[in-house]
């Protein structure tokens, strides 16, 4: 039977793949030399374990989980990665002054295991 994309974390609350927010300054990110604003970013990222069939993104992730159980030294467990992103606009330094630039893959919106 096809495995279910489970949302129940068998490792306990907050231990499995989910969205985390980390407050970071431009200095923390190494952006201070090219970004002017915002000076602080609420960075959303995907962190956590990917146990059996938890938020499996696709059949490949399900297969990976099964094979990892059989051959943990050969096949790694699925990884927790963004399923989609929220866009963000930055005010950047340019040679002639400042400009706006949008980035569509900077902040995770939700997470899955792949």
């Amino acid at each position: 039977a096809r495995a279910r994309n489970g949302d129940h974390c068998p490792l306990g609350p907050g231990r499995c793949c989910r969205l985390h927010t980390v407050r970071a300054s431009l200095e923390d990110l190494g952006w201070a030399d090219w970004v002017l604003s915002p000076r602080e970013v609420q960075v959303t990222m995907c962190i956590g374990a990917c146990p059996s069939q938890f938020r499996a993104a696709n059949m490949h992730a399900q297969i990976k989980t099964s094979l990892h159980r059989l051959k943990p030294d050969t096949v790694p467990a699925p990884c927790c990665v963004p399923a989609s992103y929220n866009p963000m606009v930055l005010i950047q330094k340019t040679r002639t002054g400042v400009s706006l630039q949008t980035y569509d893959d900077l902040l995770a919106k939700d997470c899955h295991c792949i």
């Epitope: 002017l36 609420q42 606009v89």
Partner: antibody, heavy 119, light 110 residues
Framework: EVQLVQSGAEVKKPGESLKISCKGS????????IGWVRQMPGKGLEWMGV????????IYSPSFQGQVTISADKSISTAYLQWSSLKASDTAMYYC????????????WGQGTLVTVSS | QSVLTQPPSVSGAPGQRVTISCSGS????????VNWYQQLPGTAPKLLIY???NRPSGVPDRFSGSKSGTSASLAITGLQAEDEADYYC??????????FGGGTKLTVLG
Amino acid sequence: EVQLVQSGAEVKKPGESLKISCKGSGYSFTSYWIGWVRQMPGKGLEWMGVIDPGGSYTIYSPSFQGQVTISADKSISTAYLQWSSLKASDTAMYYCARYGRYGTYFDYWGQGTLVTVSS
Amino acid sequence: QSVLTQPPSVSGAPGQRVTISCSGSSSNIGVLYVNWYQQLPGTAPKLLIYSNDNRPSGVPDRFSGSKSGTSASLAITGLQAEDEADYYCQSWDSSSNYVFGGGTKLTVLG
């Protein structure tokens, strides 16, 4: 409660100068950008420019570059839009709006300031 | 001429479902996001949908947004008299930064 309160309606003659204001309250004024949007009578919305009140960085729409000046005074949580020489075609409703945290949309709007320029 | 194209008007009877389209290009909607605003008569615009399909708190779930390719849509189900307003889509364009559609006037019939 987040609020943007704009200054009152203005009636001016062509060639006169004008500065309208937008006072933010209920949030950290320097943590969010402020944009200005024009709406001419019976028309749609046009983005004019943006200011980061914390660093006073400003960026203008190409259509409004050199026509207006956007500024802010963070000590009184107020953003400004000004003209040095008004034209009849500047007659419009002007809105200030706060950007959402990631700078992609406007999450709160002022009530608008109607500017009428007529001889 | 707006970078984003919307129909000038749409209408529907109370209780019906209506959709408003917003057509762009590969330099705006095609690669990025769409936001929607509602402007009731004589008032300031209000954020209705952000980042294609997210509703701010307080916006009824009768309003929903979607995006496909270089077009986006706003759907309103269970149309109510108080939905009569102008609706604007907004995105980002590489040449002119923040851009709005020309606006769509929604009329609730009857």
